[in-house]
Amino acid sequence: ASGSASGSASTLVHNGTSARATTTPASKSTPFSIPSHHSDTPTTLASHSTKTDASSTHHSSVPPLTSSNHSTSPQLSTGVSFFFLSFHISNLQFNSSLEDPSTDYYQELQRDISEMFLQIYKQGGFLGLSNIKFRPG
Amino acid sequence: SVVVQLTLAFREGTINVHDVETQFNQYKTEAASRYNLTISDVSVSDVPFPFSAQSHHHHHH
């Protein structure tokens, strides 16, 4: 059984602030590159996905993340903090279309959640959200 | 209901876990009115970077 998935849960919504990711020469790619495919490893920060007239899922480019100091980390300099957030939306029903970013339900919910987080964390430090995943409650 | 899991990125030193959760909880009422999203069971934790897909996905119960 072969196949691969779309870059489903890789969404970065950002508010225009920038920070820079530094990589060592050993890195295969920057940690914030946009994947064309992914299987079960949505570890990248990508951009907000939108439906386009060209009938494809479009990923706009992401400003690089910035930081004043360089670190010895092979993947990312210090300068960025990540938080895992989980919550229930009790007045919505899960269905299988929430497993696929090309569906209207997925895109509408993702858009609302993305906008909501931009409202909540308006302060300058917020860089964005990524790895969004929906599952039944 | 729908469970939403995601990762938030902030410039280092601008916010901590407690504040991420507090600000999110304070917004829940507005989220209900503005986006018609009734939010509950909020959970926030630190993610060491580079975070693996495994660590991301296995936070749920």
Partner: antibody, heavy 117, light 107 residues
């Protein structure tokens, strides 16, 4: 690489039930959906239903409601499809297809179920 | 239910030929359409997801496009391993439905 391995071929009598398993192997997680699809001889593929592994969430095609039951065993990374009250027209190859960031990303090899008296 | 009308039901072609398969949806499905390949032995593999995105490991000779309610799978230069049956699949609304299939045979 993710692989979906289905149970072996079955021969059943009309009125009986059959339970087909679909085990995910390789680098995988317990939180994803499995769709079940069947293909009768000379017929188009037909969607039967969906289950989100590790939960009791299911969706069924109305055509099969009441006869098909989808279940899963998270610890074994296995999904099951049970079809009851079998009739000759249920003779088909049954496929599972799992999600991985999008629907129907990976497919099992198929399980032939023959219903014959 | 959403009907997918796939054409042609079969075609004969030679290695190197450009092959086009079309699927017409009875209702608006946006970009929620996949293309699948079924080998003669029965194994199914997804080639294209979300109308036009190529799955990893799938050769670039395969492409998907859309014009209104018509969805197209194109094989730019047919290879020996491409002789198989191709299906479109919509997942815009339940029950998810499939096209009738197109069998690509050697001329």
């Amino acid at each position: 690489e993710v692989q979906l391995v289905q149970s072996g071929a079955e021969v059943k009598k009309p009125g009986a039930s059959v339970k087909v398993s679909c085990k995910a192997s390789g680098y995988t997680f317990t939180s994803y959906g499995i769709n079940w699809v069947r293909q009768a001889p000379g017929q188009r593929l037909e969607w039967m239903g969906y289950i989100y592994l590790g939960s009791d969430y299911t969706e069924y095609n109305e055509k099969f409601k009441g006869r098909v039951t989808l279940t899963s065993d998270t610890s074994a990374s296995t999904a099951y499809m049970e079809l009851s009250s079998l009739r000759s027209e249920d003779t088909a190859v049954y496929y599972c297809a799992r999600s991985a960031g999008s629907l129907f990303a990976y497919w099992g090899q198929g399980t032939l179920v023959t219903v014959s008296s | 239910d959403i009907q997918l009308t796939q054409s042609p039901s079969s075609l004969s072609a030679s290695v190197g030929d450009r092959v086009t398969i079309t699927c017409r949806a009875s209702q608006d499905i946006g970009i929620t359409l996949n293309w699948l390949q079924q080998e003669p032995g029965g194994a199914i593999k997804r080639l294209i997801y979300a109308t036009s995105s190529l799955d990893s490991g799938v050769p670039k000779r395969f492409s998907g496009s859309r014009s209104g309610s018509d969805y197209t799978l194109t094989i730019s230069s047919l290879q020996p391993e491409d002789f198989a049956t191709y299906y479109c699949l919509q997942y815009a609304s339940s029950p998810y439905t499939f096209g009738g299939g197109t069998k690509v045979e050697i001329k």
